[in-house]
Interface confidence: low
């Protein structure tokens, strides 16, 4: 499956967890292995134009959920989401466009 | 032109309720952490909570948390401070306060914008 | 929660003069440290926020700057209307707090 498409999936399920079901243990088990693939680095180049397009703000989005671990400070993970949503609506724009 | 305005405040009986309004213009309070903040007469700043309409995330200072609740209502662009059980030590100026919560993040948890204050009097 | 320990609580200063205002953190508060000015029966006005940052519209002679948990204020040339209370305040914890408060007085 294409990155676009399971960061699509993915945010979509982890926002209903986070902000459905304030489920913050299932959100993280949704979008770790998204930035787990993330990390391991583009293979392809539609991979690597993901990465270029979306890459820094997912990180940072990452950054702040990560602190968050630490610091249990809940604006922690609201300024994550802050970042997902954003990503969210550029892949979503960039989804219709091109379908 | 950003603004924010509070109501609701008055004198209150020891036990009583009181609701706060504070009503935002020139933003959306959707996308902004909005804060209480209260000064007791000659005394410095307290903050008492928060939401983020967004999520709907609230906090509560130790002192007011189980008493009072912060609320939103986005259609009309107000949050609210539900003031229960009073007590005369909440006698203060209560404040409401901006905090951006957009993307991107800009004043990182400082307080941008604040209304003109609402005395709130708790006394027999 | 995190406490923010002001010092002064109060200082006199003439017109001119160079005013540093200290705020300790009871632990890591990152850079999220805001300064704001208070003038009696008016609302706190923002001067300061990521601990360093000046916020647009404040005259250049008001600085902050941080070093491991402490935070200063300071004031380059004190002017007339500088006379007021200053807090500090995090906001890297859950609960979000104030430094009690520091009254600047003309000497």
């Known amino acids: 499956i294409l990155w676009h498409e399971q960061w699509h999936e993915g945010l979509e399920e982890a926002s209903r967890l986070y902000f459905g079901d304030r489920n913050v243990k299932g959100m993280f088990e949704i979008l770790e292995p998204l930035h787990a693939m993330l990390e391991r680095g583009p293979q392809t180049l539609k991979e690597t134009s993901f990465s270029q397009a979306y890459g820094r703000e997912l990180t940072e989005a990452y950054e702040w959920s990560q602190r968050y671990k630490t610091s249990a400070v809940v604006m922690d993970l609201d300024r994550a989401w802050d970042i997902y949503y954003h990503v969210f609506q550029k892949i979503s724009r960039h989804h219709h466009h091109h379908h | 032109e950003v603004q924010l305005v509070e109501s609701g405040g008055g004198l209150v009986q020891p036990g009583g309720s009181l609701r706060l309004s504070c009503a935002a213009s020139g933003f959306n309070v959707s996308s902004s952490y909005i804060h209480w903040v209260r000064q007791a007469p000659g005394k410095g700043l307290e903050w008492v909570a928060y939401i983020y309409p967004y999520s709907g995330y609230t906090s509560y200072a130790d002192s007011v948390k189980g008493r009072f609740t912060i609320s939103a209502d986005t259609s009309k662009n107000t949050a609210y401070l539900q003031m229960n059980s009073l007590r005369a030590e909440d006698t203060a100026v209560y404040y409401c306060a901006r905090n951006y919560g957009g993307y991107p993040r800009k004043y990182a948890g400082a307080f941008d914008y604040w209304g003109q204050g609402t005395l709130v009097t708790v006394s027999s | 929660d995190i406490q923010m320990t002001q010092s002064p609580s109060s200082l006199s200063a003439s017109v001119g003069d160079r005013v540093t205002i200290t705020c300790r953190a009871s632990?890591?508060?990152?850079?999220?440290v805001a300064w704001y000015q208070q003038k009696p029966g008016k609302a706190p006005k923002l001067l300061i926020y990521s601990a360093s940052s000046l916020y647009s519209g404040v005259p250049s002679r008001f600085s902050g700057s941080r070093s491991g948990t402490d935070f200063t204020l300071t004031i380059s040339s004190l002017q007339p209307e500088d006379f007021a209370t200053y807090y500090c305040q995090q906001s890297y914890g859950s609960l979000i707090t104030f430094g009690q408060g520091t009254k600047v007085e003309i000497k």
């Open positions: 632990q890591s508060v990152s850079s999220a």
